[in-house]
């Protein structure tokens, strides 16, 4: 890894678990300044592997709302607009970090948690098992 | 929103910015216990809108390594294995939370940051504006 010289202006931590427990400012800085606001908004319908978005809410988590993609079909949409089972719609999944309140119901104490979310779907060639 | 009764065992915070600055335990709890480790690993090659994964490293960020998808083609792969321009490969993007060291180079002080990442690609019908 890369060794970074410590900034002398860093806050001190008296926590016995240091450096495992850290201070986090929740005023979110949004880096997505130069993006097209339309982005992926209509891809779920225009895709050959379309998906629906389901709201997953958990007040003990930050962010409390996460949208999960569920592929609409087993196959993919062909040029005629029909579902073609020569291909498969599959979810593209990503591991993301969220903050989990710990102990539960505490407003100012969290633990990092890794969760797997389905972001959208893509159309893939199926894995074909050949039989003699 | 949902009102949650405060747990009396919560740690106190003397921070003047409370509740915007919170304590976070970095011992990550992984909820992805029952997932297939292979997951989306080969979709990037099997997809009709294949993508390459590019490593984005930033030691001032947690996690420091994020993988970004870049669609390989302008069009999508058809049944003959050729790029077909009737369709377009587009990235599926997701906003994720990361921790940014603040002040810089501090090991125990972070700020939440929202970044947009491309997770994979999907094949979409183009926006057609003109009729013969």
């Amino acid at each position: 890894g890369i060794t970074i010289p410590r900034n002398p202006g860093c806050p001190n931590s008296e926590d016995k678990n240091f450096p495992r427990t850290v201070m986090v400012n929740l005023n979110i800085h949004n880096r997505n300044t130069n993006t097209n606001p339309k982005r992926s908004s209509d891809y779920y319908n225009r895709s050959t592997s379309p998906w629906n978005l389901h709201r997953n809410e958990d007040p003990e988590r930050y962010p409390s709302v996460i949208w999960e993609a569920k592929c609409r079909h087993l196959g993919c949409i062909n040029a005629d607009g029909n579902v073609d089972y020569h291909m498969n719609s599959v979810p593209i999944q990503q591991e993301i970090l969220v903050l989990r309140r710990e102990p539960p119901h505490c407003p100012n104490s969290f633990r990092l948690e890794k969760i797997l979310v389905s972001v959208g779907c893509t159309c893939v060639t199926p894995i074909v098992h050949h039989v003699a | 929103g949902i009102t949650i009764p405060r747990n009396p065992g919560c740690p106190n915070s003397e921070d003047k910015n409370f509740p915007r600055t919170v304590m976070v335990n970095l011992n990550i709890h992984n909820r992805n216990t029952n997932t297939n480790p292979k997951r989306s690993s080969d979709y990037y090659n099997r997809s009709t809108s294949p993508w390459n994964l590019h490593r984005n490293e930033d030691p001032e960020r947690y996690p420091s390594v994020i993988w970004e998808a870049k669609c390989r083609h302008l069009g999508c792969i058809n049944a003959d294995g050729n790029v077909d321009y009737h369709m377009n490969s587009v990235p599926i993007q997701q906003e994720i939370l990361v921790l940014r060291r603040e002040p810089p180079h501090c090991p125990n002080s972070f700020r939440l940051e929202k970044i947009l990442v491309s997770v994979g690609c999907t094949c979409v019908t183009p926006i057609v504006h003109h009729v013969a």
Epitope: N36, K38 | K70, C71, R72, H73, L74, N82, V83, Y85, H86, N88, S89, V90, P91, C121, P126, I127, V128, H129, H130, V131, A132
Partner: antibody, heavy 118, light 107 residues
Framework: EVQLVESGGGLVQPGGSLRLSCAAS????????MSWVRQAPGKGLEWVST????????DYADSVKGRFTISADTSKNTAYLQMNSLRAEDTAVYYC???????????KYYPWFDYWGQ | DIQMTQSPSSLSASVGDRVTITCRAS??????LAWYQQKPGKAPKLLIY???SRASGVPSRFSGSGSGTDFTLTISSLQPEDFATYYC?????????FGQGTKVEIK
Amino acid sequence: EVQLVESGGGLVQPGGSLRLSCAASGFSFTSYMMSWVRQAPGKGLEWVSTIYPESGATDYADSVKGRFTISADTSKNTAYLQMNSLRAEDTAVYYCAREGYYYSTSIKYYPWFDYWGQ
Amino acid sequence: DIQMTQSPSSLSASVGDRVTITCRASQSISSYLAWYQQKPGKAPKLLIYGASSRASGVPSRFSGSGSGTDFTLTISSLQPEDFATYYCQQRYSQPITFGQGTKVEIK
């Protein structure tokens, strides 16, 4: 009204670099593929590169691969062509062109160069 | 790469003449062909796409036909503003390729 305005051309020594810009207006920039097509003095048209701003996906002619880089800034509605390691044979008029998807009876819909810069 | 060969390279014609330009692809390109008109010092202009569909604002005297490897651009009655160079272009596969051009001159 659709407009494509190129800039950035000039005289450069072999091995030098140049960056061309194509400012687009009058249409939804991310919905179209944008290309660069060149024409050497007294010669025909040669496709150079294409980008789809919505995806960032790109394609290049073999003659420029590894030397030229096409990019797009969707906030500025501008496509760019960064040309490095320039050679005498790169001397040409470079046109920026939009590829619009058109319906036709024969092949449903497909992209064609419908507007060109001047 | 798919080679596009136009013939003739140049032709002389008079106003009112019927003019035919042909374009041959080195392999089948179905109907993935366009025709462009270019006047000196100007950018090309789309005339025909999908081998036979006329682009918006293009006069009806311009027509396109063909599929597979052989294509034709026809100007039914040549007008003074039609004197220019015409290019065919295939969009069947990358790289996109153009014909070498046909120059239509005044006789």
